[in-house]
């Protein structure tokens, strides 16, 4: 079942999917001046069996001005890139696919693809949020949103993420220096830490971590 809406928008934050559930579709979009080849796929589809998931179909773009097709890129499981409707950024740490049955990794780029990827998520998909550059999270730990089905309708859970600008640290004379972020994790947490500089979440661990004190209870 496809999710009706996009994941929630959080001020000064972007989201990423670490892996994509089977059934997810990725539009074959081309950058300005290029278009899909005739008879080319409209989208890629994450499909699989009990042991392996991969992207079906291939996206191919050709120049709008010529009839020559560009080199075909076959989707292969690869490093993480960026998420739905944001500019693609530097690769992220690969997720251990073996730990995520029924999921596809981020498809590799195809030649002349658009700068934004448009995904169509399915129920059960989880995405993770981080503050954009220049903003910092008020709370520690991954802020996540999950597409759920309730009463026959799909909805995304709301991540408890507040991203604040760093223009004011307000250290008054005599005030102690701020603590560094703890080196190790407190006993009830795992080793992942999400801040503006660290978004290398291991998906299978992140799902167990807190976002709001009570979101695990609430949601």
């Amino acid at each position: 079942e496809l999710c009706d809406d996009d994941p929630p928008e959080i001020p000064h934050a972007t989201f990423k999917a670490m892996a994509y559930k089977e059934g997810t579709m990725l539009n074959c979009e081309c950058k300005r001046g290029f278009r899909r080849i005739k008879s080319g796929s409209l989208y890629m589809l994450c499909t699989g069996n009990s042991s392996h998931s991969s992207w079906d179909n291939q996206c191919q773009c050709t120049s709008s001005a010529t009839r020559n097709t560009t080199k075909q890129v076959t989707p292969q499981p690869e490093e993480q890139k960026e998420r739905k409707t944001t500019e693609m950024q530097s690769p992220m740490q690969p997720v251990d696919q073996a730990s995520l049955p029924g999921h596809c990794r981020e498809p590799p780029p195809w030649e002349n693809e658009a700068t934004e990827r448009i995904y169509h998520f399915v129920v059960g998909q989880m995405v993770y949020y981080q503050c954009v550059q220049g903003y910092r999270a008020l709370h520690r730990g991954p802020a996540e949103s999950v597409c759920k089905m309730t009463h026959g309708k799909t909805r995304w859970t709301q991540p408890q993420l507040i991203c604040t600008g760093e223009m004011e640290t307000s250290q008054f004379p005599g005030e102690e220096k701020p603590q560094a972020s703890p080196e190790g994790r407190p006993e009830s947490e795992t080793s992942c830490l999400v801040t503006t500089t660290d978004f290398q979440i291991q998906t299978e661990m992140a799902a167990t971590m807190e976002t709001s004190i009570f979101t695990t209870e609430y949601q």
């Epitope: 928008e9 001020p11 910092r136 008020l138 730990g141 600008g165 640290t169 004190i213 009570f214």
Partner: antibody, heavy 114, light 111 residues
Framework: EVQLLESGGGLVQPGGSLRLSCAAS????????MHWVRQAPGKGLEWVSV????????YYADSVKGRFTISRDNSKNTLYLQMNSLRAEDTAVYYC???????WGQGTLVTVSS | QSVLTQPPSASGTPGQRVTISCTGS?????????VHWYQQLPGTAPKLLIY???ERPSGVPDRFSGSKSGTSASLAISGLRSEDEADYYC???????????FGGGTKLTVL
């Protein structure tokens, strides 16, 4: 069970100082931003200050900026509010609150009067 | 004066449905920040009633619901009970203050 317990309130003269403490338990204190919110007698809630989970940044309401200082000790699961140059209008119940704020303490009364 | 605007009072009879409005601006509710609602019973600390616009913490009856649209939000209480008599506050983060802002509170009276 989440618990937030404020202490340090009391009667102080104008211009005086107080240090409030908030002892936290029942959740991973070091993962959450913490707030001080106050409520003057018979009035509504007024946000005072917030500190990020690691203490790396703090923000203050204009009414207390330059006089109050928020801090935290994650090793002790404790939040602090140092209040200097107190004024009569600072008289209120001071609550510490965690997260959204999701949870609140029961509050400690600060009375500024001569 | 509070940054978020609420009616100072509201009332209803048992079993009735009442709504409390909360109006903000482009730096808080209108900026996309979530709205939270708190219930404060006489002589007690505020308690989170609704978070993230329309989510209920466990233990909060489904008689309480929230919604948000544009720069405003509302809290609805259906099947009003005498124990609902309390002060209700809305709150949202404000990016110009870098902190949460509260409504002035609405005193709900069950007639």
């Amino acid at each position: 069970e989440v618990q937030l317990l404020e202490s340090g309130g009391g009667l102080v003269q104008p211009g005086g100082s107080l240090r409030l403490s908030c002892a936290a338990s029942g959740f991973t204190f070091s993962s959450y931003g913490m707030h001080w919110v106050r409520q003057a007698p018979g009035k509504g809630l007024e946000w005072v200050s917030v500190i990020s989970y690691d203490g790396s940044y703090k923000y203050y309401a204009d009414s207390v900026k330059g006089r109050f200082t928020i801090s935290r000790d994650n090793s002790k699961n404790t939040l602090y509010l140092q209040m200097n140059s107190l004024r009569a209008e600072d008289t209120a119940v001071y609550y510490c609150a965690a997260g959204v704020p999701d949870y609140w303490g029961q509050g400690t009364l600060v009375t500024v009067s001569s | 004066q509070s940054v978020l605007t609420q009616p100072p009072s509201a009332s209803g009879t048992p079993g009735q449905r009442v709504t409390i409005s909360c109006t903000g601006s482009s730096s808080n509710i209108g900026a996309g920040y979530d709205v939270h609602w708190y219930q404060q019973l006489p002589g007690t600390a505020p308690k989170l009633l609704i978070y993230s616009n329309n989510e209920r913490p466990s233990g909060v009856p489904d008689r309480f619901s929230g919604s948000k649209s544009g720069t405003s939000a509302s809290l609805a209480i259906s099947g009003l009970r005498s124990e609902d008599e309390a002060d209700y506050y809305c709150a949202a983060w404000d990016n110009s203050l870098n902190g949460p802002v509260f409504g002035g509170g609405t005193k709900l009276t069950v007639l």
